[in-house]
């Protein structure tokens, strides 16, 4: 694999964001040792770009079998195509492996868009630019899929990193994460920074491009600038979190916070938009729609149906409102604020038609199970996912892509509230999500 | 407990329409295909087609492909078959099932009896 | 379309025997992905079918373990090693390999 390609990103991307200095946080941790630092091994082991998932190179099996697996935060299934498919390249062969035991029990999993079955059994797994370390971890074989692999995202497999209650058939399978935690000395954590490219690439650039970094086991002090303000895991299913306020441009949307989280909040690599409930939908785009009103988009547009499109390097950035979640912070009353630009929920297409225009889909859009903080919002930030402290974090990212007016930021604290009720109570039930 | 419960028997008159329905419990017909099939008097099972209620997509069998129209409401956890310009070959048992990725029916209706007279 | 040809479209038993009941495809049903997607049902009088067997030799959850399928490409076989009561009723292989899903004619499994 290609490591360490990176494509020269337009406008004064990568490096530290110009402009605001963040205020640093005054009681942060002293260091612990493992759990920060560096961990050159590990930087820009992610490819891909957002509407298509970011994947991390695994090998499964004795001798080992290299996959490309799509890193998913929205679900708990380490799962791998594992016979012919037409948008796969390779394939796990459970046959070739002297090491693969079978469990003798199927699985199904429906996610937001795709589904598939498969056949649960155990082997052994690493990460080539991971954890020096190999587990037995469970691995559902995937012998049959409909609209779940993607034809030319190179990934042949997903990498469930949430929390055993969502695993399917039931959460007596164990997660790939809570196995590398239990069989070495793997500290519970784990951290991402998804870059999104900022325009288009075609199937040669992505091959070449660095799409990122998941740091297993600890945090990499490249990866950000600024303090990492954290907010509670609420429940661990999902990564849970609570949204306390939202504004566009500095307005706050003015609803009762419960509709943020309607039925529930969610951080999720492998959704591609910010997705929001229908009310906080509908409110967010009246509010962008008027920011931006300077110029008219089709209702398409907003609907992410169309693309809208603009001579190459004359994207009216400036015209778009930036978008702040208030988060529940870790002290009573305290909140912290995450902003992201138009360069993160603007999502850059490839446009066949006029291919040197630079076109772009509206990457926010309605969701029927609470808000989903997808890739466009992660490719602003450093996120992590501390499972040892029930927590997750954010800063900006040192990869995401910005221009010289304004860029992401990580804010706070503010005084909040009644946080708590912030919170939906949710009859339960389980649930799987995946790129949308 | 898993249930496909369809809705009632019909006795239509020819070149009418009649829309059937089939409402799911124990589960989300969204996490699922439903899939709905014909049985007539001593003819054996036919597929008519299925249904992603996900994302409205649909399949048809050729033969019904201008007969009938499959379509699904996850609010209501219900799927429907409309039949249209009956004649009397319509009149049969239809009947809906699940299925997951793999087509195999592994929960059905009680089916519904469609009479087509005059 | 995929023609199912059961044999014989009428078997006379008496319980404990043993059944046996043939399927046949006019071609082979090996999907691309290398499995073959040939199932069976029971229908019994005044009820809708239910599955006993999913990709040829996989027995639906709940169903007693008399019932086998075995088979590949394009010949397949149920059988029921010894029968009971509550085994009588009509017996259907059907493919989904190929598009549209097809079935049998069914074989009804009676007693002498």
């Known amino acids: 694999t290609q490591h360490g390609i990176r494509l020269p990103l337009r406008s004064g991307l990568g490096g530290a964001p110009l402009g605001l200095r963040l205020p640093r946080e005054t009681d942060e941790e002293p260091e612990e040792p493992g759990r920060r630092g560096s961990f050159v091994e590990m930087v820009d082991n992610l490819r891909g770009k957002s509407g298509q998932g970011y994947y991390v190179e695994m090998t499964v099996g004795s001798p080992p079998q290299t996959l490309n697996i799509l890193v998913d935060t929205g679900s708990s299934n380490f799962a791998v195509g594992a016979a012919p498919h037409p948008f796969l390249h390779r394939y796990y062969q459970r046959q070739l492996s002297s090491t693969y035991r079978d469990l003798r029990k199927g699985v199904y999993v429906p996610y937001t868009q795709g589904k598939w079955e498969g056949e649960l059994g155990t082997d052994l797994v690493s990460i080539p630019h991971g954890p020096n370390v190999t587990v037995r971890a469970n691995i559902a074989a995937i012998t049959e899929s409909d609209k779940f692999f993607i034809n030319g995202s190179n990934w042949e497999g997903i990498l469930g990193l949430a929390y055993a209650e969502i695993a399917r058939p039931d959460d007596s399978l164990e997660p790939f994460f809570d196995s590398l935690v239990k069989q070495t000395h793997v500290p519970n954590l784990f951290s991402l920074q998804l870059c999104g490219a900022g325009f288009p690439l075609n199937q040669s650039e992505v091959l070449a491009s660095v799409g990122g970094s998941m740091i297993i086991g600890g945090i990499d002090h490249s990866l950000y600038t600024g303090s990492l303000w954290y907010t509670p895991i609420r429940r661990e299913w999902y990564y849970e979190v609570i949204i306390v306020r939202v504004e566009i441009n500095g307005q706050d949307l003015k609803m009762d916070c419960k509709e943020y989280n309607y039925d529930k909040s969610i951080v999720d690599s492998g959704t591609t938009n910010l997705r929001l409930p229908k009310k906080v939908f509908e409110a967010a785009v009246k509010s962008i729609k008027a920011a931006s009103s300077t110029e008219k988009f089709p209702d398409g547009f907003w609907l992410g149906e169309q693309l809208v499109c603009w001579q190459a390097g004359t994207t009216p950035w400036n015209i778009f409102p930036v978008i702040s979640l208030y988060l529940m912070g870790e002290v009573t009353n305290q909140s912290f604020r995450i902003t992201i630009l138009p360069q993160q929920y603007l999502r850059p297409v490839e446009d066949v038609a006029t291919s040197q225009d630079d076109c772009y889909k509206f990457a926010i859009s309605q969701s029927s199970t609470g808000t989903v903080m997808g890739a466009v919002i992660m490719e602003g930030f450093y996120v992590v996912f501390d499972r040892a402290r029930k927590r997750i974090g954010f800063a900006v990212s040192a990869c995401h892509v910005h221009d010289e007016f304004r860029t992401a930021a990580v804010e706070g604290p503010f005084v909040t509230l009644d946080m708590e009720d912030c919170g939906y109570n949710i009859p339960q039930t389980d649930e799987s999500t995946l790129m949308t | 407990e898993i249930q496909l419960q369809q809705s009632g028997a019909e006795l239509v008159m020819p070149g009418s329409s009649v829309k059937l329905s089939c409402t799911a419990s124990g589960f989300s017909i969204a996490d699922y295909y439903i899939h709905w099939l014909k049985q007539r008097t001593e003819q054996g099972l036919e597929w008519i087609g299925k249904?992603?209620?996900?994302?409205?997509?649909?399949k048809y069998a050729p033969k019904f492909q201008d007969k009938a129209t499959i379509t699904a409401d996850t609010s209501s956890n219900t799927a429907y078959l409309q039949l249209s310009r009956l004649t009397s070959e319509d009149t049969a048992v239809y009947y809906c099932?699940?299925?997951?990725?793999?087509?195999?029916?592994?929960?059905w209706g009680q089916g519904t009896t469609v009479t087509v007279s005059s | 379309d995929i023609q199912m040809t059961q044999t014989p479209l009428s078997l006379p038993v008496s319980l404990g025997d043993q059944a046996s009941i043939s399927c046949r495809s006019s071609q082979s049903l090996v999907h691309s992905n290398g499995n073959t997607y040939l199932h069976w049902y029971l229908q019994k009088p005044g009820q809708s079918p239910k599955l006993l067997i999913y990709?040829?030799?996989n027995r639906f959850s709940g169903v007693p373990d008399r019932f086998s399928g075995s088979g590949s490409g394009t010949d397949f076989t149920l059988k029921i090693s010894r029968v009971e009561a509550e085994d009588l009723g009509v017996y259907f292989c059907s493919q989904s390999t190929h598009v549209p899903l097809t079935f049998g004619a069914g074989t009804k499994l009676e007693l002498k």
């Open positions: 990709k040829v030799s």
């Open positions: 099932a699940r299925t997951m990725v793999v087509e195999r029916f592994d929960y």
């Open positions: 249904i992603d209620p996900a994302d409205g997509e649909t």
